[in-house]
């Protein structure tokens, strides 16, 4: 999906009002210095591309974050403020339902959410290019 035509300011508002708080809640009890950020993003479409991938793609040691509150709110924000996003996600959602597992907060998931926090912070940088 090409995130170029999203309403970035509306997504930023959704992040600041709720998503950021849900990420902090998920990370509660973890020191902010515990994980090194190894990925970043260039402009807002890039940030959303990486946020989407990191939030919804299973990775080694962290099978799924998709059912977490921050992920559901991220998905809703993208569906509302990115034209055509919902249609591209129908097949992906069906595949995700098939492989859904019991929620377990592993250290790898904490590390992944720490990376997500960094990507969202970069997305919100005032000087970051729209596209």
């Amino acid at each position: 999906y090409d995130f170029t035509n999203c309403d970035f300011e509306k997504i930023k508002a959704a992040y600041l009002s709720t998503i950021s708080k849900d990420l902090i809640t998920y990370m509660s009890g973890t020191k902010s210095t515990e994980f090194n950020n190894t990925v970043s993003c260039s402009n807002r479409p890039h940030c959303l591309t990486e946020i989407q991938s990191l939030t919804f793609n299973p990775t080694a040691g962290c099978a799924s974050l998709a059912k977490e509150m921050f992920a559901m709110k991220t998905k809703a924000a993208l569906a509302i403020w990115c034209p055509g996003y919902s249609e591209t996600q129908i097949n992906a959602t069906q595949a995700m339902k098939k492989r859904r597992k019991r929620k377990v907060t592993t250290n790898k998931c904490l590390e992944q959410v720490s990376q997500l926090q960094g990507l969202w912070r970069r997305f919100n940088r005032p000087l970051l290019k729209q596209q």
């Epitope: 190894t38 991938s53 290019k129």
Partner: antibody, heavy 117, light 108 residues
Framework: QVQLQESGPGLVKPSETLSLTCAVS?????????WSWIRQPPGKGLEWIGY???????SYNPSLKSRVTISRDTSKNQFSLKLSSVTAADTAVYYC??????????WGQGTLVTVSS | EIVLTQSPATLSLSPGERATLSCRAS??????LAWYQQKPGQAPRLLIY???SRATGIPARFSGSGSGTDFTLTISSLEPEDFAVYYC??????????FGQGTKVEIK
């Protein structure tokens, strides 16, 4: 520390597909960062080809996108480049590098690929 | 596509002298700029990122400055091992990251 090593044929015929592999040691490619390919034609500057991130997102240079595929094999801790329909203009030293998806902090030593019949 | 223009193409200096290399972007890249050093037959090495932050292990004689469209890499006092080609790279314009054409710093 992380080390990267490119391998693959040094000579490819025009119209064929160039295939290179980058073996990574000292760091798991599924643990963090992105893993990138960059090339440098003889005596010229650098050109970014694309990357695959540790969580599988892929990004390509738009000028090469139609011909490029980057993939990974986490069990072997390596990632690969395929460039199709090559011409003499694709003759270059090809580097693999570790990236934070912005800049490139560790590089392989590079491998020269010549496109010639 | 953002074009990076480096100047001069070649800089002839003696060890101990100060080197000032320029990189100009065709449009603003904020501080999203890196500098690399490349010696003959070797891969590039990251020197500076975010326009002014030194990469791990890079000596303090290397410094970067600038923002927007005009950037400078300064080597305060050239050591023999500093004679090489230097490239700038912008990462403001994903997915079109681009490099400058390079500046060669040679021994006078």
């Amino acid at each position: 520390q992380v080390q990267l090593q490119e391998s693959g044929p040094g000579l490819v015929k025009p119209s064929e597909t160039l295939s290179l592999t980058c073996a990574v040691s000292g760091y798991s490619i599924s643990s963090g960062y992105g893993w990138s390919w960059i090339r440098q034609p003889p005596g010229k500057g650098l050109e970014w080809i694309g990357y695959i991130s540790y969580y599988g997102s892929i990004s390509y240079n738009p000028s090469l996108k139609s011909r490029v595929t980057i993939s990974r094999d986490t069990s072997k801790n390596q990632f690969s480049l395929k460039l199709s329909s090559v011409t003499a203009a694709d003759t270059a030293v090809y580097y693999c590098a570790r990236t934070n998806l912005l800049y490139f902090d560790s590089w392989g030593q590079g491998t020269l690929v010549t496109v010639s019949s | 596509e953002i074009v990076l223009t480096q100047s001069p193409a070649t800089l002839s200096l003696s060890p101990g002298e100060r080197a000032t290399l320029s990189c100009r972007a065709s449009q603003s890249v904020s501080n999203n700029l890196a500098w690399y050093q490349q010696k003959p037959g070797q891969a590039p090495r990251l020197l500076i990122y975010d326009a002014s932050s030194r990469a791990t292990g890079i000596p303090a004689r290397f410094s970067g400055s600038g923002s927007g469209t005009d950037f400078t890499l300064t080597i305060s006092s050239l050591e023999p091992e500093d004679f090489a080609v230097y490239y700038c790279q912008q990462y403001s314009d994903w997915p079109q990251y681009t490099f400058g054409q390079g500046t060669k710093v040679e021994i006078k």
